[in-house]
């Protein structure tokens, strides 16, 4: 069939913040590069019909459906969604094809389905159909990568069950503790799911995929290490695979490794050797246990030990379900204007907990680190020493904990005094909570000393910053202070300040503000 | 059943040596770390050796150099071997399985005294 | 060395009584120990493992707990037959090392 254009139909992904709804346009954004759909012709179908591959889009994001038409002359288009017609402005590009786009900003459930374009050109007319639907992110998972040996090698393959396929690597480092920090030099990075080198220092494997990125560090017992001052300790859940590594260092071949639980040898299948020669002609030999699927009677004191190094254990725990072990009781704390104070909370979790830290209504990133004792520690310093109420949320796949703090920052009271008809007011934050006095002004006491005790009525109320006090204080018009200037004070163990307040008629008058320390 | 049977104590002049056996059955011998704990009359408990399946041994400071722990698989015998014996040595020996962690069974003893 | 100290190193209770009986590592031995019960004239005998856990067909009055440097070692209700002198013991590092024993009576 010698008529048949050539045409080719692309999906360009975007990158942008705009809000609107499909329309036809000549003016592509800002891009990734076009992915190819290949438009095939549909076969049994009435009149000449090319299908695009199935188009999966992410909710909110930002799409254009292209076709390039390699045919003489110029061409005539509509686009139909619906049972819509929608607008189409072909184009020419430098190599002279016609170019049809469809763009689709911040992709919505309503924008999901068929989308029909029709071309006329000298020569003929056919369709083009584009089905598009929208990404079922509910579906997606990020699981934490595990470990297995790899038939007949002495070699790790790294495996993260998770949808979207993840992206696998291992992240090795060989130097001990801060330079082993992400970023650091001395880590290198390998994007394949088979290990071979296993004795470096610190060998983790990560997997990625839309919804991020999830890491599995392979637990090791370096004899050659001074011991920690507490157990190491690992937890897994029912049918999770164990793997401990034990590494050991030694002037020469001569020496051998062993593993036990509690006080028994690891049976055989249960563990397997390797060793080599290091640059300086050491010998480096590694001793992995591991267990397949773990089982509540796998829980115990796993103990690596060596004819030629001190033995080290690690205590193995296996849970039925995850958890997460901290204090949930709230705690108050009170800190000065300028003083440096972080919130931390110290927890012991399985697996790995996802935290956020909140204030009034908003959510601020939390950052954990694991402690020596099998603890980690979140902390949050951000506060800019704004009183009120801050929660902490944690979660894993199998609990959830939440722990709330108050804040109180210690400040002389500021006063904001207003008046009605019928009463006036006077309202103060400081903390601690001021007390409060009121003061007649009159020809008998120009310093407003004389104390009004009738008809004040103070209280304490939450106010609109969360969790945070104000104390007020009101004092209800009496025919005896009409007419009189009158001065609230608010004071606590930082200070005193005061408001002048004249009681004649309504609206809020406010005169002077005293600041007495 | 798990059982360890003791023997070769008995009186031995300072200076002196003696070795110990301890016969075991019940259970998988060679897959098991063992053990000799002492107790001198009156007091209580201390650690004297361990050897773990891998046949790696294990002394405190007291008796290193001149107590030495061996293991014969196909016998299921566990041995203690005591040389330049002296009078702080008196005690009834145990042999106990484990030491890896805990001991979790314990023969019922054999009494070594060294006097002159 | 690790020193474990026990205390008290004896106590007189009477039947049905709680009895409790400490141990203090010299450092932290995490979890990492053991109670044993040794009768007069008899071998010791394995009763809790891992600081709280009961060994095979322990009774349940007997329990542990602590972690870290302080543990303790319960009878919920002395029976007769509990007579014995009880030790604690490491096994976070070695030496391997005991306490002193707390022998228990009968008032």
């Known amino acids: 069939n010698q008529d048949l254009p050539v045409i080719k139909c692309v999906l360009i992904n975007h990158k942008n913040n705009d809000s609107s709804v499909g329309k036809s346009s000549s003016y592509p954004m800002v891009s990734e590069s076009p992915e190819d759909l290949g438009c095939a012709l549909r076969p049994q179908s009435s009149g000449t019909v090319y299908e695009a591959a199935a188009v999966e889009v992410d909710v909110s994001a930002s799409i254009t459906l292209q076709v390039l038409v390699d045919a003489p002359g110029n061409i005539s288009c509509l686009w139909v969604f619906k049972h819509s017609s929608l607008n189409c402005q072909p184009h020419f590009d430098l190599q002279n094809r016609g170019v049809v786009s469809m763009v689709i900003l911040k992709m919505t459930e309503t924008q999901a389905g068929e989308y029909l374009l029709f071309i006329q050109s000298e020569a003929t007319n056919y369709t083009i159909l584009f089905t598009v639907s929208i990404r079922n992110t509910l579906l997606y998972t990020l699981r934490r990568p595990y470990f297995r040996k790899m038939e007949n090698q002495d070699a790790l393959v790294c495996i993260s069950e998770s949808v979207p396929e993840p992206i696998v690597e291992w992240v090795l480092c060989d130097s001990q503790g801060e330079s082993c920090k992400e970023e650091s030099p001395a880590v290198v990075k390998k994007e394949e799911k088979v290990l071979h080198e296993l004795f470096g220092t610190d060998i983790r494997c990560c997997a990625r995929n839309e919804l991020g990125r999830e890491c599995t560090r392979l637990f090791t017992i370096d004899l050659n290490q001074t011991p920690q001052t507490t157990l190491p300790q690992l937890f897994l859940k029912v049918g999770e695979p164990l793997w401990i590594r034990c590494k050991a260092v030694h002037v020469n071949h001569g020496f051998g490794l062993t593993w036990e639980l509690e006080n028994k040898a690891l049976e055989e299948g249960n563990y397997f050797e390797m060793s080599t020669y290091s640059t300086n002609r050491t010998m480096i030999r590694i001793l992995f246990a591991f267990v397949s699927s773990v089982a509540r009677n796998d829980t115990g004191y796993y103990t690596c030990s060596s004819s030629k190094h001190p033995s080290q254990s690690a205590l193995v725990t296996i849970v039925e379900k995850g958890f997460i072990n901290a204090t949930n009781s709230s705690e108050d704390y009170e800190i000065d204007q300028y003083e440096e104070f972080c919130f931390s909370v110290r927890f012991k979790a399985y697996p790995q907990i996802r935290c956020t830290w909140t204030f009034s209504r908003k959510s601020f990133p939390c950052e954990q680190k694991g402690l020596d004792n099998g603890y980690s520690i979140s902390k949050f310093c951000n506060h800019k020493h704004q009183p009120g109420e801050y929660i902490f949320h944690a979660e894993n796949d199998d609990a959830q904990f939440t722990k709330m703090f108050t804040l109180n920052i210690r400040r002389k009271p500021q006063v904001l005094a207003e008046a009605s008809a019928s009463q006036a007011s006077c309202f103060s934050d400081g903390y601690p909570l001021p007390s409060w006095t009121w003061k007649k002004c009159s020809d008998k006491s120009p310093n407003c000393t004389e104390e009004i005790t009738e008809g004040v009525w103070n209280r304490k109320a939450n106010r609109k910053v969360f969790g945070q006090w104000v104390s007020s204080s009101t004092l209800n018009m009496s025919e005896a202070i009409k007419g009189f200037l009158v001065k609230c004070c608010a004071y606590n163990s930082l200070g005193t300040s005061c408001e002048t307040i004249l009681l004649n008629s309504p609206g809020p008058f406010p005169f002077i503000q005293d600041n007495i320390s | 059943e798990v059982q360890l049977v003791e023997s070769g104590g008995g009186l031995v002049q300072p200076g002196g040596s003696l070795r110990l056996s301890c016969a075991a059955s019940?259970?998988?011998?060679?897959?098991?770390?063992m053990s000799w704990v002492r107790q001198a009359p009156g007091k209580g408990l201390e650690w004297v050796a361990s050897?773990?399946?891998?046949?790696?041994?294990y002394y405190p400071d007291s008796v290193k150099g001149r107590f030495t722990i061996s293991r014969d698989n196909s016998k299921n015998t566990l041995y203690l071997q005591m040389n330049s014996l002296r009078a702080e040595d008196t005690a009834v020996y145990y042999c106990?399985?484990?030491?890896?962690?805990?001991?979790?069974?314990w023969g019922q003893g054999t009494l070594v005294t060294v006097s002159s | 060395d690790i020193q474990m100290t026990q205390s008290p190193s004896s106590l007189s209770a009477s039947v049905g009584d709680r009895v409790t009986i400490t141990c203090k590592a010299s450092q932290d031995v995490s979890t990492a120990v053991a109670w044993y019960q040794q009768k007069p004239g008899k071998a010791p005998k394995l009763l809790i493992y891992s600081a709280s856990y009961r060994y095979t067909g322990v009774p349940s009055r007997f329990s542990g707990s602590g972690s870290g440097a302080d543990f303790t070692f319960t009878i919920s209700s002395l029976q007769p037959e509990d007579i014995a002198t009880y030790y604690c013991?490491?096994?976070?590092?070695?030496?391997?090392?005991f306490g002193g024993g707390t022998k228990v009576e009968i008032k």
């Open positions: 013991q490491q096994h976070f590092n070695t030496p391997r090392t």
């Open positions: 106990a399985r484990g030491g890896t962690t805990v001991f979790d069974y």
């Open positions: 050897i773990n399946s891998g046949g790696f041994t």
């Open positions: 019940g259970f998988t011998f060679s897959s098991y770390a």
